[in-house]
Amino acid sequence: EPHSLRYNLTVLSWDGSVQSGFLAEVHLDGQPFLRYDRQKCRAKPQGQWAEDVLGNKTWDRETRDLTGNGKDLRMTLAHIKDQKEGLHSLQEIRVCEIHEDNSTRSSQHFYYDGELFLSQNLETEEWTVPQSSRAQTLAMNVRNFLKEDAMKTKTHYHAMHADCLQELRRYLESGVVLRRTVPPMVNVTRSEASEGNITVTCRASSFYPRNIILTWRQDGVSLSHDTQQWGDVLPDGNGTYQTWVATRICRGEEQRFTCYMEHSGNHSTHPVPS
């Protein structure tokens, strides 16, 4: 998987009036990395691993960047026409990636009230608008404003591609996120289900990267997909991931079932506790 930095900013308006403040989250390699603390008006690392990325450096640069981006997004929302009364949101998601062959990709996406209406490839500066007519109208609003704005001043919209990649490289230089492998901790539990049945759950936690195979086997053969329940692979807040798989089995047959885990070239099997 490529290394990635993903900015997610949201601003709100009420009855056409743009509200002060903004919401911001930054993900590094798919993990929650930074959050903008509105009380303290600061960018804050999400968990110990995020703090380790910059070590003892301050987060002033990140605070300044997020504040500037939030201000720009508020201005963009202020230029969206025909805002209905009530609460509305404008969300900007910006992603840049560095692939293993050192090629790069950058994109920016705008959502109004949760609906995608404008995307831009930041390398080619090519815009894409969904077919829906509402999206076309919203996109016209925003593109007209961005064009005007770019004429007046060199905003972050022009420098975003370069800035995002520069930040991503800076974070990668710390070594904390560079192709590390953290093996999962695997834990199998059982719980009572219906008469004569038990539910067995296999949990894998604190692993990185996120790609993992976790499945139940009976007599060494993987169970069919539809006899198992799967959890999403989710960040656990420490720069690692967690997931689970469960199935229902007959009481007394526990010894026939094992949880099979494969991660980063390593694999293991885990029995059901008696």
Epitope: D15, G16, S17, A78, H79, K81, D82, Q83, K84, E85, S133, R134, Q136, T137, M140, N141, N144, F145, E148
Partner: antibody, heavy 118, light 107 residues
Framework: QVTLKESGPGILKPSQTLSLTCSFS??????????VGWIRQPSGKGLEWLAH???????YYNPSLKSQLTISKDTSRNQVFLKITSVDTADTATYYC??????????WGQGTTLTVSS | DIVMTQSPATLSVTLGDRVSLSCRAS??????LHWYQQKSHESPRLLIK???QSISGIPSRFSGSGSGSDFTLSINSVEPEDVGVYYC?????????FGSGTKLEIK
Amino acid sequence: QVTLKESGPGILKPSQTLSLTCSFSGFSLSTSGMGVGWIRQPSGKGLEWLAHIWWDDDRYYNPSLKSQLTISKDTSRNQVFLKITSVDTADTATYYCARRLNGYFDYWGQGTTLTVSS
Amino acid sequence: DIVMTQSPATLSVTLGDRVSLSCRASQSISDYLHWYQQKSHESPRLLIKYASQSISGIPSRFSGSGSGSDFTLSINSVEPEDVGVYYCQNGHSFPFTFGSGTKLEIK
């Protein structure tokens, strides 16, 4: 109290340029979210939206007439202008200006009538 | 462009009747639909905004409903001053198209 009033030449010959003025009071086009649009109505027919200008000088035109239309504003004088080049008899209509806020036209002028005739 | 279709073209009613005017959009416009009333020799007047939201100063006998592509304007008990043409308008997306109108007349 919001009021809008249109003024125009009344009669034009084909191929001439129509210049319309909308003078308004009770609101300002410097207020965020505010817009003024032009709508026309041939006698006994329906309404056709022509053009729109916003507080931030963003302008929208009806695509079917875009090449003929120019909308502009003078914020300090509370006026919006519409020019239609090379009119013909199909442009004979009553022309309205209307305030647009939050997505709808909430106040309309009384209209000005244009007759195009050779 | 979004095409707005109104029906019927003309509606002849008796005073006191409850009437319904229909407006259909050629594609979904959520609730971004506005109704206007135009009396003879007058300019249009906003009646209902966003499909069902009332406008101050408009009599409560006027109400709107619908979402997506089908909308209805209802007049609870028709009065003589309700005679005129009723237009629906797409407020969802550019260009802002109007329906062709429904003419309301008294029998």
